[in-house]
Structure formats: C-alpha cells, structure tokens
C-alpha cells in the first residue's frame, strides 16, 4: 500500500520545508484516498465484467450511498462553506460501513482495501477539527450499521461484486465532489 | 458442459459420522461458491451452508452449525460434506449445488447423495 | 430470512390447459436489475430439476411452455399446455442471499 500522506520519506529529508497548512493536509488526504480507490478499482473491474455495467443497472439498487445534491452546498452554483463542510463529514460517516463491507471484497489488494478505511477515518478527523457546527452532524446508528453489513455480506456472489463496483464507484464521486468544494474553503 | 457429480448412498449407524464428496467440471472450480441442500423423504429442502472453493470461506444455515462441515480440494475440484453424530433426523438426501453468477450462470445441482441413518 | 410463500399446495389441470403456480416472498428478492428466483421441478426419487433461473430464463432443455415472470416479490410460474410429463411437485426458490430459501412446493397433478 502507498505511504499514507505526511509518512513520505521527502518529508524526512526535508526538515526545514513549511508544514502543511490544515487546507493542504485535507487535500493530500483526499487525493491519496483517491489513488487506493483507483488500485481497488482496477482489481475489480480484471476480476469481472462489472466495470462496463450499466448506469441504469446500477441505478436499481436499495443501497443507500451518500450523494452531493443541490441542496448540500457544495456546488459552485449556491455554495455554503458550513452546509458543504457538514455534508461531506455526514457522508463520510455514512460510506464507514460500506468501507467495513470492501474489506473482505479484495483478493491482491487486501492491504489497500484497508488502507482507503483507515485514511477515511483520518480524513474525517481533520474535517471534524475544520467544522464549527459539530452538532448539526449526525452519526450513524451502529446497530442499523451492523444489520446493514450483515445483509450485505449475505448476498449472493454476483451481487457482491455489483455492490463492490457500487460502492467504489459512488465513493470516488463523492470524494472529488469534496474535494472542489473543500478548494473553494 | 457443468456437471456435479455426487458421491454414493450412505447406510450409517447412528453416533457415526459421514463423508460425502461433490466432483465439479466444466467450469474453474475455484470461482463459484458451492452450496449444500437437505431433502427429507417427502418434504422440501432446506439450506445447509456454502463453501468459496477459492478461499476456504464458509457460511452456515444456524441450524446445521456442529452437525455438518463443509471442505474442499482445488487440486481435484472437490467439495465436502461432513456430518457428525447422526440421528434419525438426518436420514435425507443432500444436494450440491453450485451458484450462478448474475443471468450470466444458472446455478447447476447434483444428483444427490442419500444418507439412511439406521442401527 | 426471506420467506417464499407458494400457492396453491396442491393444482388439477387437464392436458392442454393452463397451470399458474404463485411464490411471494417476504421482501424483495431483486438486485440491480435482476429478480433472484428459480423455479424447480421435482419427480419422486429425482433431484430437483432447475427449470426457470432469474424469474423468466428457462433452463437447458427446458420446453418452451414453462414460462417464468414476475419482480420484487411477486413470481408465477405458467405451464402451457399441460402435457402428461408435467405431474410433479413444483419449487419456487430464491438466490439473492443465504439463507438460500423454498417455497412448500405445489403438487401439480393432470385433472
């Protein structure tokens, strides 16, 4: 698995560089998320034909993946700095579980799948210390998550692999999403 | 063409236990999970658990949890089905059954293998 | 679980009409576009033989007559025209998940 930002060997051997301000650190974080995202994705789509499924395919799921909308801010058009900051931790909270799901999904990339969960958790953390209304964000509930994950892990094989592909597919978007709205901050 | 090919009929003493192979081909092995099917004489079937032939993994109907243990072996493309302690009850035949994938694969079943449990 | 419910549990039919054979299950046994039910049928001393896969695809073999439809929780199975090979015990099943789950079975005789 890649170093995880701020691990990076240049970062020893350049003691005297300016430390990373919150803003850059948010965005290195993303980005290397972004980068375990793509090997992941690249596992699944040599594993089968998932990759060339159809959107409208991938429309009919009951899976209930986090998605930028109008109304969260985060758009150009209609931009709110705090609505924005408290979608993207909600959302980031609500994907935990379905990154818990990938964990066993992976065959050659077991320590990426791993590594996108943890840099998660870390990247939520930054964001948490960033956001000023940490009330307005709601938790997920961990008892409808477990029940969540066991529905999930009880598919059928074909089913896994569609949700993985899901999942993946719906995580990337939401983190570039993030990731032009948190540029803007 | 797929074919799962079962094991003969058992006639086992009650205590003992009993081994029952499925032999896969026509397709990798290793790339569909394989299921196991209980059928008491004149009545419907029941799921017992599946094994992932690739990893080992397996899942278990609650109910068969300690009574029944599922193996495989990828050099002879072959699934396992252990039952333990037998009683009466489990007097049945047992099917494999392997999972589709999508509408892309039907799931394909064994002929069965009939297990009498008698003293 | 999910929970296959089939009617009626046991049918007449002369030779060359219609036998509709109903499963609902419990909760939706679809997925990305796909319904997760098979329809099975079963001669005495037989296994099970798969005669409908993903609620509408017929299975090897399968004659033309054994039709498949339905989604979410609803599925039939439609035999047609009833032909003397068709008295046997009929299974509706779902594959979506583990448990896999069966209907009761209905006994399909020629009236």
């Known amino acids: 698995a890649p170093v995880p930002p701020g691990e990076d060997s240049k970062d020893v051997a350049a003691p005297h560089r300016q430390p990373l301000t919150s803003s850059e650190r948010i965005d290195k974080q993303i980005r290397y998320i972004l980068d375990g995202i793509s090997a992941l994705r690249k596992e699944t789509c040599n594993k089968s034909n998932m990759c060339e499924s159809s959107k409208e395919a991938l429309a009919e799921n009951n899976l209930n993946l986090p998605k930028m909308a109008e109304k969260d801010g985060c758009f150009q058009s209609g931009f709110n700095e705090e609505t924005c900051l408290v979608k993207i931790i909600t959302g980031l909270l609500e994907f935990e579980v379905y990154l818990e799901y990938l964990q066993n999904r992976f065959e050659s990339s077991e320590e990426q799948a791993r590594a996108v969960q943890m840099s998660t958790k870390v990247l939520i953390q930054f964001l948490q210390k960033k956001a000023k209304n940490l009330d307005a964000i709601t938790t997920p509930d961990p008892t409808t998550n477990a029940s969540l994950l066991t529905k999930l892990q009880a598919q059928n094989q074909w089913l896994q692999d569609m949700t993985t592909h899901l999942i993946l597919r719906s995580f990337k978007e939401f983190l570039q999403s993030s990731l032009r709205a948190l540029r803007q901050m | 063409e797929v074919q799962l090919q079962q094991s003969g009929p058992e006639l086992v003493k009650p205590g003992a236990s009993v081994k029952m192979s499925c032999k896969a081909s026509?397709?990798?092995?290793?790339?569909?999970?394989m299921h196991w099917v209980k059928q008491k004489p004149g009545q419907g079937l029941e799921w017992i658990g599946y094994?992932?032939?690739?990893?080992?993994?397996?899942k278990y109907n609650e109910k068969f949890k300690g009574k029944a243990t599922l193996t495989s072996d990828k050099s002879s493309s072959t699934a396992y089905m252990e039952l333990s302690s037998l009683t009466s009850e489990d007097s049945a035949v047992y099917y494999c059954a392997r999972e589709g994938y999508g509408n892309l694969e039907r799931d394909c079943w064994g002929q069965g293998t009939s297990v009498t449990v008698s003293s | 679980d999910i929970v296959l419910t089939q009617s009626p549990a046991s049918l007449a039919v002369s030779l060359g009409q219609r036998a509709t054979i109903s499963c609902r299950a419990s909760?939706?046994?679809?997925?990305?576009?796909?319904?997760?039910m098979n329809w099975f049928q079963q001669k005495p001393g037989q296994p099970p033989k798969l005669l409908i896969y993903?609620?509408?695809n017929q299975g090897s073999g399968v004659p033309a007559r054994f039709r498949g439809r339905g989604r979410g929780t609803d599925f039939s199975l439609n035999i047609h025209p009833m032909e003397e090979d068709d008295s046997a015990m009929y299974f509706c099943?779902?594959?979506?998940?583990?448990?896999?789950?069966f209907g009761g079975g209905t006994k399909l005789e020629i009236k």
């Open positions: 026509g397709y990798t092995f290793t790339s569909y999970v």
């Open positions: 909760e939706s046994v679809d997925g990305f576009g796909i319904s997760f």
């Open positions: 099943q779902q594959s979506k998940e583990v448990p896999w789950t």
């Open positions: 993903v609620a509408s």
């Open positions: 094994i992932n032939p690739y990893n080992d993994g397996t």
